[in-house]
């Protein structure tokens, strides 16, 4: 099976790499614009220059292209705890990240939120916090993991998943309750 190509890919595939087919004359291949620039006017004929203009402030193109407009620079989302790692230039989008001792959680492909790395209080660090993953904690005896925090087994209800980890403590609590019911 031949993979389906979009119209733009079909047009580009007729020309050698670094060139694109003139939209009004498919016998002409024009040179693509360099990153940091955009297409202002197609080349007038074979071997003639494409009219490329530099992206204006607040916009960029990160690769060679024949776009009619530069792409708008991304803004770091303060409400998600994001901070700017590097600002937008004509040939590179803004890079957003998190502060020290924080990690990124991706809610979707293009949206992340910054959260504090867990400190593993009442436990030990099994895997250190990474750029896109929270610390992995192992809890001490008498504690169980809930929302990546080590919580005392005294907070373990019988219906919760912690019952296996806290089984001796649960039995002790049950025994104490039963002893007063004679």
């Amino acid at each position: 099976l031949v993979p389906h190509l979009g119209d733009r890919e079909k047009r580009d595939s007729v020309c050698p790499q670094g060139k694109y087919i003139h939209p009004q004359n498919n016998s002409i291949c024009c040179t693509k614009c360099h990153k940091g620039t955009y297409l202002y006017n197609d080349c007038p004929g074979p071997g003639q220059d494409t009219d490329c203009r530099e992206c204006e402030s607040g916009s960029f193109t990160a690769s060679e292209n024949h776009l009619r407009h530069c792409l708008s620079c991304s803004k770091c989302r303060k409400e998600m705890g994001q901070v700017e790692i590097s600002s937008c230039t004509v040939d590179r989008d803004t890079v957003c990240g998190c502060r020290k001792n924080q990690y990124r959680h991706y809610w979707s492909e293009n949206l992340f939120q910054c959260f504090n790395c867990s400190l593993c209080l009442n436990g030990t660090v099994h895997l250190s916090c990474q750029e896109k993953q929270n610390t992995v904690c192992t809890c001490h005896a008498g504690f169980f993991l809930r929302e990546n925090e080590c919580v005392s087994c005294s907070n373990c209800k019988k219906s919760l998943e912690c019952t296996k980890l806290c089984l001796p403590q649960i039995e002790n609590v049950k025994g104490t309750e039963d002893s007063g019911t004679t």
């Epitope: 303060k78 809610w107 939120q113 959260f115 929270n134 929302e147």
Partner: nanobody, 119 residues
Framework: EVQLLESGGGLVQPGGSLRLSCAAS????????MVWVRQAPGKGLEWVSH????????FYADSVKGRFTISRDNSKNTLYLQMNSLRAEDTAVYYC????????????WGQGTLVTVSS
């Protein structure tokens, strides 16, 4: 006690519109970023949109961009989601929620309102 109550769901034909509302109480609504998430039948939660406290620069998932509009009325403690050009794939239970703070889970969200897009 935080309470979030969604309304406005229902059955609508493809291409139709609906406006969801979320009445909030038990916290200072005007200080919180609010979120719409949805869960299609047999699928996981999908982040639809969120709006910061001042209402500026809301975020939209690519799947709803240009069709949905999130807004809020801080004087009425209410969050809205205007849904236009609805498609069958928008069929889901829609929940409003407070933006998580402690970790990647929702501490506070509503009971949901069902949106069904079908002819």
């Amino acid at each position: 006690e935080v309470q979030l109550l969604e309304s406005g769901g229902g059955l609508v034909q493809p291409g139709g519109s609906l406006r969801l509302s979320c009445a909030a109480s038990g916290f200072t609504f005007a200080h919180e970023t609010m979120v719409w998430v949805r869960q299609a039948p047999g699928k996981g939660l999908e982040w639809v949109s969120h709006i910061p406290p001042d209402g500026q620069d809301p975020f939209y998932a690519d799947s709803v961009k240009g069709r949905f509009t999130i807004s809020r009325d801080n004087s009425k403690n209410t969050l809205y989601l205007q849904m236009n050009s609805l498609r069958a794939e928008d069929t889901a239970v829609y929940y409003c929620a407070l933006l998580p703070k402690r970790g990647p889970w929702f501490d506070y969200w509503g009971q949901g309102t069902l949106v069904t897009v079908s002819s």
